[in-house]
Amino acid sequence: GSTAIGMKETAAAKFERQHMDSPDLGTGGGSGIEGRGSMGYRGSEQAPELENLTVTEVGWDGLRLNWTAADQAYEHFIIQVQEANKVEAARNLTVPGSLRAVDIPGLKAATPYTVSIYGVIQGYRTPVLSAEASTASGLNDIFEAQKIEWHEGTHHHHHH
């Protein structure tokens, strides 16, 4: 894992720590919107699309993602954060379907990233939504350090 400086623990990080043993996310300002029941989406139909993905700086080494999604019962959101130049392996994160915002700490400062996200409804993926953003260039808003664990990127060496 890596050590992230500049992130306060939030409700979602606490939820992750208590229930998922992987404390690598926090909610952004307008998070926690609950899906209120499925509108009867079936895999044979076009999946509802996520919209309005915005990515903003959080501290010097973090990004905050906000998105909107149809008021349906999403099972999960799957997020990928990749350096724009693809030098390092992508980082993937799975978050509960009730969230509409998440903080991604532990990134490199002053680095452009491509962020991609999709949702899962009734076992099927929605289309991918992507955005580009850069982390800040200096040390600011230094809070207590928090250890972050990312799982292995998906585009690396392969064993068969």
């Epitope: 895999g43 099972e75 799975t94 392969h158």
Partner: antibody, heavy 118, light 108 residues
Framework: QVQLVQSGAEVKKPGSSVKVSCKAS????????ISWVRQAPGQGLEWMGG????????NYAQKFQGRVTITADKSTSTAYMELSSLRSEDTAVYYC???????????WGQGTTVTVSS | DIQMTQSPSTLSASVGDRVTITCRAS??????LAWYQQKPGKAPKLLIY???SLESGVPSRFSGSGSGTEFTLTISSLQPDDFATYYC??????????FGQGTKVEIK
Amino acid sequence: QVQLVQSGAEVKKPGSSVKVSCKASGGTFSSYAISWVRQAPGQGLEWMGGIIPIFGTANYAQKFQGRVTITADKSTSTAYMELSSLRSEDTAVYYCAKGNFYGGLDYWGQGTTVTVSS
Amino acid sequence: DIQMTQSPSTLSASVGDRVTITCRASQSISSWLAWYQQKPGKAPKLLIYDASSLESGVPSRFSGSGSGTEFTLTISSLQPDDFATYYCQQNKKFPSGTFGQGTKVEIK
């Protein structure tokens, strides 16, 4: 770097159950999706189902619904696939595999041979 | 479940040939498609994901294209190591999904 190591070969009687394990190392096991795929002798690949250990919820292929149970133990970084009511046509090599962001299976276990015979 | 149909089931070719394998989905899967190579007694190997993205370490002679219901895997110049069976897989289903029945590429 992810490695998936599966349990050894099994010989089972028709009507019984088999439980195959898949131990992961490298990366954070709880966050990525594990799928189970089987291949009968001389046949193609069949996706059976998969799980994200972080949530513990599994999705299954229609064909196997009700007969397969996929679980995961985060404390040991191990995924399990249990297939019940075995019949001779379940004789196959069973693979576990890790999915990438787009669902492609980029790391595979070595395979576990399950033979169903009376 | 979404059905995947591959063609041809067997393909005879020579080293240096350009080879194309097609895969058709029973309904639109956008670009949620992967291609694999498998050799006898071995686990499959991921070649292409997201319909056209080349997996790390896979030679550039492999390419994928298509979206919706029609997809192709192309090997621009067949090499001795490429004689194997190839499978497509739809990934619209989460966390993964159904495979095509496979295409065996054999020596002519």
